[in-house]
């Protein structure tokens, strides 16, 4: 399987709501042995690999927002701590997987990360991540609503959570 | 506070039986996968078993498959290992830790430490 | 099964030196390694995860590096609490292994 991110770059005025997405797409076993899970983290663009680093969004880690299922099975995080933070992360029974992050500000300006590991019995794991820059404007230069950029280059795209 | 307590541990003869328990606090211990992992006196770490958040799927080292079963209680937040037909190979101090797919051992208890010796 | 071999098995320094682990695996593990400290008594510590990242709170002056099968963990200046022992650790394939171990001891 792969993970595909629509939109590379979500521009965004403060104060606004966005979702983030990626789209889990290719042969996905639904079997009994098989399971997903999903999650976001922030990161950096290293040298080496991108999404390497795995940085907390708003203080909760990876750990906190992820979510486990089966197959293409739809799921949220029902995390009290994850919504006091404006945070939610879902998956729906297309493949697509989000972080819905409410309220923006500066701070949340930066490059974001979904990973999917597929856990097969008794074989290794397969990690796929994707990357998206988030960048947080203000002022009088900030678009009115989220503008997003997909992933091949082509037109901008506004956007509501 | 974020912490694993083991406990059960102590003396067994050969052929006995033991059953250790990891007590989980100050996290969501049904999102988390659990492993045990031991450590023989002076020696390095060894990978024991591995349970899933739901219980399924388990996994246990060739060197206690049929002997040692893995089993947890989200309910109770705890985690056990039931140790049966021990042998003076399997003394070794026993550590819970904390798991999760595509990560690794974040978190680790104290240790209860485990002596088979007749 | 994956074996991890570390060298050296015992590393004689003195404080403000610098440290150099190296972890070794009998096939690849891709870049799915870590580092893990343990001092007497105590409960392993994770300070290097996904064979070139830190574990948070750890500091700067330890470093990893390292994909496939040969892996290092640096210390770049030794404090007084980094003697120790030091464990690699891979999760590419079942069953999770751990290397041997290096221990880092004061000269």
């Known amino acids: 399987f792969k993970v595909a991110t629509l939109y590379s770059l979500y521009v965004c005025p403060e104060g606004q709501n966005v979702t983030l997405t990626c789209r889990v797409f290719g042969p996905v076993d639904k079997g009994h042995d098989v399971t997903f899970y999903k999650t976001w983290y922030r990161s950096s663009r290293g040298e080496v690999q991108t999404c390497s680093e795995r940085r907390p969004i708003r203080n909760l880690t990876f750990q906190d927002l992820h979510l486990h299922h089966g197959g293409h099975q739809a799921a949220n995080t029902s995390h009290d701590l994850a919504q006091r933070h404006g945070l939610e992360s879902a998956s729906d029974h297309h493949g697509n997987f989000s972080i819905t992050m409410r309220n923006l500000t500066l701070l949340d300006s930066g490059l974001y990360c979904c990973l999917v590991v597929e856990i097969r019995h008794h074989h290794s794991e397969h990690r796929v991540h994707g990357a998206m820059e988030l960048q947080v404007q203000t002022g009088k230069d900030a678009p009115s609503s989220c503008v997003a950029y997909p992933s091949s280059s082509q037109e901008s795209e506004n956007i509501t959570a | 506070q974020v912490q694993l307590v083991e406990s059960g541990g102590g003396l067994v003869k050969p052929g006995g039986s033991l059953r250790l328990s990891c007590a989980a606090s100050g996290f969501t211990f049904s999102d988390y996968y659990m492993s045990w992992i031991r450590q023989a006196p002076g020696k390095g770490l060894e990978w024991v078993s591995y349970i899933s958040n739901s219980g399924s799927p388990i996994y246990y080292a060739d060197s206690v498959k049929g002997r040692f079963t893995i089993s947890r209680d989200n309910a109770k937040n705890s985690l056990y290992l039931q140790m049966n037909s021990l042998r003076a190979e399997d003394t070794a101090v026993y550590y819970c830790?904390?798991?999760?797919?595509?990560?690794?051992?974040?978190?680790w208890g104290r240790g209860t430490l485990v002596t088979v010796s007749s | 099964e994956i074996v991890l071999t570390q060298s050296p098995a015992t590393l004689s320094l003195s404080p403000g030196e610098r440290a150099t682990l190296s972890c070794r695996a009998s096939?690849?593990?891709?870049?799915?390694l870590a580092w893990y400290q343990q001092k007497p008594g105590q409960a392993p510590r994770l300070l290097i995860y996904?064979?070139?990242n830190r574990a948070t709170g750890i500091p700067a002056r330890f470093s990893a590096s390292g994909s496939g099968t040969d892996f290092t963990l640096t210390i770049s200046s030794l404090e007084p609490e980094d003697f120790a022992v030091y464990y690699c650790?891979?999760?590419?394939?079942?069953?999770?292994?751990f290397g041997q171990g290096t221990k880092v001891e004061i000269k």
């Open positions: 830790a904390r798991d999760l797919p595509g990560w690794y051992f974040d978190l």
């Open positions: 650790q891979q999760r590419n394939n079942w069953p999770r292994t």
């Open positions: 096939q690849s593990v891709s870049s799915y």
């Open positions: 996904d064979a070139s």
